[in-house]
């Protein structure tokens, strides 16, 4: 009797499943009891001996490229072999990378976690993802895994984490990258400092005074708004960062205190009061403030 | 197939401004930055600066900022590039072209524009 | 800003006969992660430039393989080794390692 190893799919894909079948094609198992294995190069695969003439392998992955084979033993303890088969698993190249951000759009709040996934829509086997940092890229990571998604996290964002990202996959077919994606970190406006600017030392009734407001840190557009003694005096808009000014000409009522407060959207932080005092110096014929 | 198709030849007057468009096709235009370089008569090649079309952000060459600016419209997968307070030695050939990351080359020009700066 | 000088600046050849023109750099170009970003493009006459070699020595797809880039640090070559008609025209080195990038001033080469 002659033994034949029947493979099906016959030229599988990674991760795909195979069925190995042990045929007897001129004697009915059912006439004899037989035992069943199945061996890849030396190799005996699954339970061992077994009264099925069918192995079922879950996925075959490119290492399990190679010559397999079966055997069938009667009660009688004849051993019947198969000639080889060799069995080659294909591999999917690694298409159509891309990386996302969590949060989605890529703006993301300082000290908040940023997620960088990198993904294919097409590959097996053990894809390497690596992740790159700027145009002229800087490797962040890599990692290696059998799946279509990687994570790169990180925990704290900082502003120094504004930079254009790109993650690469690669399985063996040479490198695919993705494209670029840029991750604007938002940033709350810090407490503003009002300064009060005026043509000479001593400001007198009909000076310009300028109130300068400005928050070092935070991401434009910052909107800022000027206060004396908590009613409103106007707004100014800075698109680009950077402070603002509001100018004032000066009545006897503008003695007081002055504040300003900033506001980007992302929370709003008020200065500290500046208060400003009216002064008659001696032998004096106008009013004066200071400061 | 990847394309950089660049605006016609401009004649332009000393002082002004001028804006030049790069339009691309075959690809997706806010996966790659785009770059510009210059390229005056009878000479050689001077780098720009770039943008970035996914969020419009600009690096540029000291040498230029300033004197241009860039900018992209992702809906029309058009890059700008605009030169104020023309001169004469602004006469030049400009180009766009994509570089593509993690391999670093530019792999695609446009076809060039010729700005002439006369009175 | 770092200068790329190229030298010669003209380049007579024969056909058939191997063409070398040197790239020199005023400091290192090699970058903080370790890779080297200079390109080799050639101009041909009324074209738009065209990429031949990057990251020094790797050939762009499509790049006859006459061609070859070599070098390192501040110093690079690139080579024909048998010119032919279609290669005449300006070639430029260029470095992408430190912004900002820069040209070399070009060379120009012609069939004698």
């Known amino acids: 009797a002659e033994l034949f190893l029947i493979a099906s799919p016959s030229h599988p894909t990674e991760g795909s499943p195979v069925t190995l079948t042990c045929k007897m094609p001129f004697l009915q198992s059912s006439d004899a009891q037989f035992q069943f294995c199945f061996f890849r190069d030396t190799r005996a695969l699954g339970p061992g001996w077994s009264s099925s003439p069918k192995l079922q392998i879950a996925a075959m992955w490119k290492e399990d490229t190679g010559s397999y084979w079966c055997e069938a033993q009667t009660m009688a303890s004849k051993v019947l072999r198969s000639r080889r088969s060799q069995i080659n698993v294909h591999r999917v190249p690694v298409a159509d990378v891309s990386l996302e951000t969590q949060p989605p759009g890529g703006q993301v709040m300082e000290g908040d976690r940023l997620v960088l996934i990198c993904s294919v829509a097409m590959g097996t086997g053990d894809i390497t993802f690596l992740w790159y940092k700027g145009a002229v890229g800087l490797n962040l990571q890599s990692k290696t895994q059998r799946s279509l998604t990687a994570e790169y996290e990180i925990p704290s964002v900082r502003e120094s984490d504004a930079e254009q990202y790109y993650c690469v996959a690669e399985n063996g077919y040479g490198p695919s990258p993705s494209g670029l994606v840029s991750i604007t970190v938002r940033i709350p406006v810090s407490r503003p400092i009002l300064m009060l600017r005026a043509p000479r030392a001593q400001a007198a009734v009909e000076d310009v005074l300028e109130l300068h407001c400005e928050a070092l840190r935070g991401s434009p557009p910052i909107l800022y708004w000027f206060y004396h003694e908590d009613i409103t005096l106007g707004s100014r808009s800075a698109p680009s960062g950077g402070g603002a000014s509001f100018n004032l000409s000066l009545t006897e009522e503008h003695s007081g205190n002055y504040s300003c407060e900033a506001n980007n959207g992302l929370g709003a932080q008020r200065s500290e009061a500046v208060t400003l005092n009216f002064t008659v110096p001696t032998g004096a014929r106008s009013n004066h403030l200071t400061s | 197939q990847v394309q950089l198709v660049q605006s016609g030849a401009e004649l332009v007057k000393p002082g002004a401004s001028v804006k030049v468009s790069c339009k691309a096709s075959?690809?997706?235009?806010?996966?790659?930055?785009i770059h510009w370089v210059k390229q005056a008569p009878g000479q050689g090649l001077e780098w720009i600066g770039w943008?970035?079309?996914?969020?419009?952000?600009?690096k540029y060459n000291e040498k230029f900022k300033g004197k241009t600016t860039l900018t992209a419209d992702k809906s029309t997968s058009t890059a700008y590039m605009e030169l104020s307070s023309l001169r004469s030695e602004d006469t030049a050939v400009y180009f766009c072209?994509?570089?593509?990351?993690?391999?670093?080359?530019?792999?695609?020009w446009g076809q060039g524009t010729l700005v002439t700066v006369s009175s | 800003d770092i200068v790329m000088t190229q030298s010669p600046l003209s380049l007579p050849v024969t056909l058939g006969e191997p063409a070398s023109i040197s790239c020199r750099s005023s400091?290192?170009?090699?970058?903080?992660?370790?890779?080297?970003?200079l390109e080799w493009y050639l101009q041909k006459p009324g074209q738009s430039p065209q990429l031949l070699i990057y990251?020094?020595?790797n050939r762009f797809s499509g790049v006859p393989d006459r061609f070859s880039g070599s070098g390192s640090g501040t110093d690079f070559t690139l080579k024909i080794s048998r010119v032919e008609a279609e290669d005449v025209g300006v070639y430029y080195c260029?470095?992408?390692?430190?912004?900002?990038?820069?040209f070399g001033q070009g060379t120009k080469v012609e069939i004698k």
């Open positions: 990251k020094v020595s």
């Open positions: 943008i970035y079309p996914g969020d419009g952000n600009p």
């Open positions: 260029f470095q992408g390692s430190h912004v900002p990038w820069t």
């Open positions: 072209a994509r570089r593509i990351h993690y391999y670093d080359y530019f792999d695609y």
């Open positions: 075959g690809y997706t235009f806010t996966s790659y930055n």
């Open positions: 400091q290192s170009i090699v970058h903080s992660n370790g890779n080297t970003y």
